[in-house]
């Protein structure tokens, strides 16, 4: 079952999957001026490897000698990149059965990767540089099935400006106010508001959300 929506956004934080569950789809997106090969629309995680490699070609139809040479170079570089990935894989990305590692980059790949996650996938959050974590629990979000729908759990993380972080730690009152009740995992209400919808997620990150505007 594919997860509806993307994992929730946490202000001043980024998320990443340490590994990808069987069935995860990654769109073959190309940067401006390039297009994907028709037969390679996406890559799918099959067990512990990806189904195929994305490829991007120039939008220009002028197959000059120079361009053909350049494409041969791309293929050569792609081969090198794939080979180089193997020994340098993250300690966290163990080769577990049913999980895939982060696919290596492809030539002329778009800057943002679009994944379609499956139920049971978890993503880990960390604060962007210049921000530090105020944590009430695990900084992860998991795609779960609840009441017949898939949705992401809310990560228990708030990222605050590093210039201010220590002030929150010093404040007993702010520590106290950050104790939120855990999400209900049991009954399905008649009116289902099971998971935050994409537009609601930022409202749910409670009072400690910071948006540094003036520095």
């Amino acid at each position: 079952e594919l997860c509806l929506y993307d994992p929730p956004e946490v202000p001043n934080a980024t998320f990443k999957a340490l590994s990808y569950k069987n069935g995860t789809i990654l769109n073959c997106e190309c940067k401006r001026g390039f297009r994907r090969l028709k037969e390679l629309v996406y890559m799918r995680c099959l067990g512990n490897s990806w189904s195929s490699n994305c490829q991007c070609t120039s939008n220009s139809h002028d197959k000059s000698r120079k361009q053909v040479t350049a494409q041969l170079e791309h293929q050569k570089e792609q081969q090198t990149t794939t080979d180089m990935q193997k020994p340098t894989q993250s300690m966290h990305q163990e080769n577990l059965t049913g999980h895939c590692r982060e696919p290596p980059p492809w030539k002329h790949e778009d800057s943002k990767r679009i994944y379609h996650f499956v139920e049971g996938q978890s993503v880990h959050y960390e604060c962007i540089p210049g921000y530090k974590a105020l944590q009430r629990g695990p900084a992860i979000s998991i795609c779960k099935m609840k009441c017949g729908k898939t949705g992401w759990t809310q990560p228990q993380l708030t990222c605050v400006d590093e210039r201010e972080h220590h002030r929150f730690l010093a404040s007993e009152e702010s520590q106290g106010s950050r104790n939120s009740s855990p999400e209900s995992e049991t009954s399905c209400p008649i009116t289902t508001t099971d998971f935050p919808q994409p537009t609601e997620t930022t409202a749910m990150t409670e009072t400690f959300v910071l948006t540094m505007e003036y520095k």
Partner: antibody
Framework: QVKLLQSGAALEKPGASVKMSCKAS????????VIWVKQSHGKSLEWIGE????????NFNAKFKGKATLTVDKSTSTAYMELSRLTSEDSAIYYC???????WGQGVMVTVSS | DVVLTQTPPTLSATIGQSVSISCRSS???????????LYWLLQRPGQPPQLLIY???RLESGVPNRFSGSGSGTDFTLKISGVEAEDLGLYYC?????????FGAGTKLELK
């Protein structure tokens, strides 16, 4: 641009109370701690305490607990400090500052005299 | 409370001269979160203080790079490489690692 505009000078009698304001503009007021600092004539600076406007959480210098009360009005992006049971020792300039001493108000001169 | 001892109390300098101010803390200012919340402020007569340096050595935006900060743990230094007339005033170190935040007694920089 960030501005902290403080209320005007105050002349008070011993035993009275005074409430001063610090109006913030140019940034998201609720997101950053407002700090209050005392500067007695010819002396160094003293940290009184701070308040986080979003939640009302505070940290205090023990010396000023019971003397200073910190509050905020989120609707007007204004922080307040009230000093009670004034004595001549409270005569000083009081500053509000935010983003860890980065931006400062112009200061409020409080004079306590009978 | 953390005591910040600033030396010297007064500093007489000529324009263009390089000077240093020391700030010694009674406790380490390294926070458990990895940062050291030690700042340097300049207060000119009749004005509120102005931030020069934060996190020991980071120059506040708009502050001339003749100002520099250094140190760690309990010993910190502010250096002005080539004093200018506008640099005259009272310099304070301040820490916000510990509650209460505390200030040094100040160093007055004056013209010789």
């Amino acid at each position: 641009q960030v501005k902290l505009l403080q209320s005007g000078a105050a002349l008070e009698k011993p035993g009275a109370s005074v409430k001063m304001s610090c109006k913030a503009s140019g940034y998201t007021f609720t997101d950053y701690w407002v700090i209050w600092v005392k500067q007695s004539h010819g002396k160094s600076l003293e940290w009184i305490g701070e308040i986080y406007p979003n939640s009302g959480a505070t940290n205090f210098n023990a010396k000023f607990k019971g003397k200073a009360t910190l509050t905020v009005d989120k609707s007007t992006s204004t922080a307040y400090m009230e000093l009670s049971r004034l004595t001549s020792e409270d005569s000083a300039i009081y500053y509000c500052t935010t983003y860890d001493f980065d931006y400062w108000g112009q200061g409020v001169m409080v004079t306590v005299s009978s | 409370d953390v005591v910040l001892t600033q030396t010297p109390p007064t500093l007489s300098a000529t324009i263009g001269q390089s000077v240093s101010i020391s700030c010694r803390s009674s406790q380490s200012l390294s926070h458990t979160n990895g940062n050291t919340y030690l700042y340097w402020l300049l207060q000119r007569p009749g004005q509120p203080p102005q931030l020069l340096i934060y996190f020991v050595s980071r120059l506040e935006s708009g502050v001339p790079n003749r100002f520099s900060g250094s140190g760690s743990g309990t010993d910190f230094t502010l250096k002005i490489s080539g004093v200018e007339a506008e640099d005259l005033g009272l310099y304070y170190c301040v820490q916000s690692t510990h509650v209460p935040n505390t200030f040094g007694a100040g160093t007055k920089l004056e013209l010789k």
